[in-house]
């Protein structure tokens, strides 16, 4: 069984709160004396809230022509690629475009791949000056293509006490750091056999939220120097070692939203909704996330507050039983008031059956 | 022992219309797709439909579109319901399981480890 | 749509000879290709799939290759149980192609 994605890395200017608000407060990002005035101000030396970002997109096939448009359940994932899906016995195929002016890779967490797919490069016997070229499955050129495959072998799904489906997550690895700082990354979620309906989703699931909260830290992004240029106005007077310009520059997000920007955070109350939490970053991303409201249940407790590392993901069931507007957001201190908040809604809705007939 | 078996073909006058049922067993196909393809006599095979067991998620080839409808009744029971038949619509239609499959953009196709003996479909006056 | 030649539409072997059978896609459907054997009366069967790979059953003197648009069956020690039609089928799973079939090659085994 094969899951075949085709997923470009491209160019996009991303804005990190599009209503110019912050949700929670209702004032202008740029407030004087706001929590937000100082990632959103833009000035002489300072970016503000939009970048220039690498994201990974899903395209319709190998022409990277058509791209696939998000719908309503999608427009969550915001900065993060597409949701990559398999159960255990799947092989997986993604056919990668890199469209980017950077050599780009992808290297996932959690699926089993030979060298020839690794989308990390090293030299088995390191050698500095050794001039060897880096194979291609780690070092896609710009303009270029190659096509990834990743095996599900039972040894890397669910266990019976897992849940039945599992958060991991994907991203660029040629300089890792700088890579997933510039965007690239993305959800996957790897699930037991038998446990999905046709087009990915979980049974008896009714939604499936992926959050990637983090510290998006611009300055370690491969393409600062673009920022600066594109959004100061003073480019030449930028010191980028200077204290206050780097930690403006530092993003508490999630899915690359801040302060409750993020959209589609919907559901009805009585849902079946899993939340998959996945992390990554440095050691500022140490993260307790919140959900006021309602609690979920994550190996038999009942929680309200989740426990988040770099590289570490979890999956999370919640049944909300309370209608109303709510947080999600990062309790560490600086990540709540740097805007690592967002605001789900549980709807009373009428229920309706879904058609799921296609023609070819 | 895996095994399908087709029944309810048989002579239809033309623009009439027919059920036919495939019948598996020796396996549970709720994580199978279960598929009907044709074969006219003298020519190649042709896909019609498939169905997901686990879900009754459904696709169709374009030329299939409102005639043809497949409907997993049981578990271990799929239909195909035809109408508004023509004689060009005569073959003998098989059922096939897809146990070997690719997702790509939203839609799956199928290789067929599995097919049933055919039952033969004629449309004549 | 994906349409799918195969030549030629008819071949002689001779018993420990070998075959080649040639399917050619009008567009790239990667290794998403199936190869079926057919004797008159029986319905298909799978010989291969993923271009190259066999179902367990299938005897190792059928062999798959290619991929792209190019793809070949090969069958070595050619036995007279071999003598069928032979069909390839592309199932490259796409929302604008019909999973489509070659119109087959007949081996006659002497």
């Known amino acids: 069984h094969v899951r075949h994605y085709y997923i470009a890395a491209e160019e996009i200017i991303w804005n990190y709160a599009p209503s110019g608000i912050d949700i929670f407060t209702k004032e202008n990002l740029t407030a004087p004396g706001s929590d937000s005035a100082v990632f959103f101000e833009q000035g002489t030396t300072r970016i503000g809230g939009s970048y220039k970002k690498l994201v990974y997109r899903e395209y319709t096939d190998a022409s990277f022509t058509n791209r696939k448009e998000r719908g309503p359940e999608e427009e969550h994932l915001g900065i993060l690629g597409p949701v990559i899906w398999a159960e255990v016995g799947d092989t997986i195929r993604v056919t990668f475009h890199n469209k980017g002016a950077y050599p780009l890779s992808i290297e996932p967490i959690g699926v089993r791949f030979n060298k020839n797919n690794e989308g990390t490069y090293y030299s088995p016997n390191y050698n500095p000056q050794s001039r060897s070229v880096p194979p291609s499955a780690s070092h896609v050129a710009p303009t270029e293509t190659f096509t990834y495959e990743w095996t599900v072998p039972k040894e890397v799904g669910p266990t019976n006490a897992d849940p039945v489906c599992l958060a991991k997550m994907y991203y660029s690895a040629v300089e890792p750091t700088k890579d997933i700082f510039t965007g690239l990354i993305g959800p996957m979620k790897i699930c037991k056999k038998g446990s999905l309906h046709a087009n990915g989703r979980q049974k008896d699931v009714d939604k499936e939220f992926y959050l990637f909260p983090t510290v998006f830290d611009e300055n370690e992004s491969l393409l600062l120097e673009d920022n600066i240029r594109m959004f100061t106005t003073a480019p030449d007077q930028v010191d980028k070692e200077d204290e206050d310009f780097q930690e403006s520059n530092k993003m508490h997000s999630m899915n690359g939203f801040m302060y409750g920007n993020q959209p589609g955070l919907t559901m009805c109350k009585g849902d079946s909704v899993v939340w998959y939490l996945f992390s990554a970053g440095n050691e500022a991303d140490v993260h307790g996330i919140y959900f006021s409201g309602n609690t979920y249940l994550w190996r038999g407790e009942r929680r309200d507050t989740a426990n988040l590392f770099p590289q570490t993901s979890l999956t999370l069931h919640m049944w909300p039983d309370t209608e109303g507007t709510f947080n999600v957001e990062c309790l560490t201190t600086d990540h709540y008031t740097g805007g690592m908040k967002q605001k789900y809604t549980v709807n009373q809705c009428r229920r309706q059956s879904e058609d799921s007939t296609f023609y070819l | 022992q895996e095994q399908l078996v087709e029944s309810g073909g048989g002579l239809v006058q033309p623009e009439g219309s027919l059920t036919l049922t495939c019948k598996a067993s020796?396996?549970?196909?709720?994580?199978?797709?279960m598929c009907w393809v044709r074969q006219a006599p003298g020519k190649r095979p042709e896909w019609i439909a498939c169905i997901y067991g686990g879900d009754g998620t459904s696709y169709f080839a374009g030329w299939a579109k409102g005639r043809f409808t497949i409907s997993k009744t049981s578990s271990t029971t799929v239909t195909l319901q035809m109408t508004s038949l023509t004689a060009a619509d005569t073959a003998t239609y098989f059922c096939?399981?897809?146990?070997?499959?690719?997702?790509?953009?939203?839609?799956?196709?199928?290789?067929?480890?599995?097919w049933g003996p055919g039952t033969l479909v004629t449309v004549s006056s | 749509d994906i349409v799918m030649t195969q030549t030629p539409a008819s071949v002689e072997a001779a018993v420990g000879g070998s075959v080649t059978i040639k399917c050619q896609a009008s567009?790239?459907?990667?290794?998403?290709l199936a190869w079926y054997q057919q004797k008159p009366g029986q319905p298909p069967k799978l010989l291969i799939f993923?271009?190259?790979s066999l179902p367990s059953g299938v005897p190792s003197r059928f062999k798959g290759s290619g991929s792209g648009t190019q793809f070949t069956l090969t069958i070595s020690g050619v036995q007279c149980a071999d003598a069928a039609t032979y069909y390839c089928?592309?199932?490259?799973?796409?929302?604008?192609?019909?999973?489509?079939f070659g119109g087959g090659t007949e081996v006659v085994v002497k």
């Open positions: 993923d271009a190259s």
């Open positions: 020796g396996f549970d196909f709720s994580s199978y797709w």
């Open positions: 567009d790239d459907i990667y290794s998403y």
């Open positions: 096939a399981r897809a146990d070997y499959y690719v997702y790509v953009d939203g839609g799956y196709g199928h290789a067929y480890d599995l």
């Open positions: 089928q592309n199932y490259y799973g796409s929302s604008s192609s019909v999973h489509a």
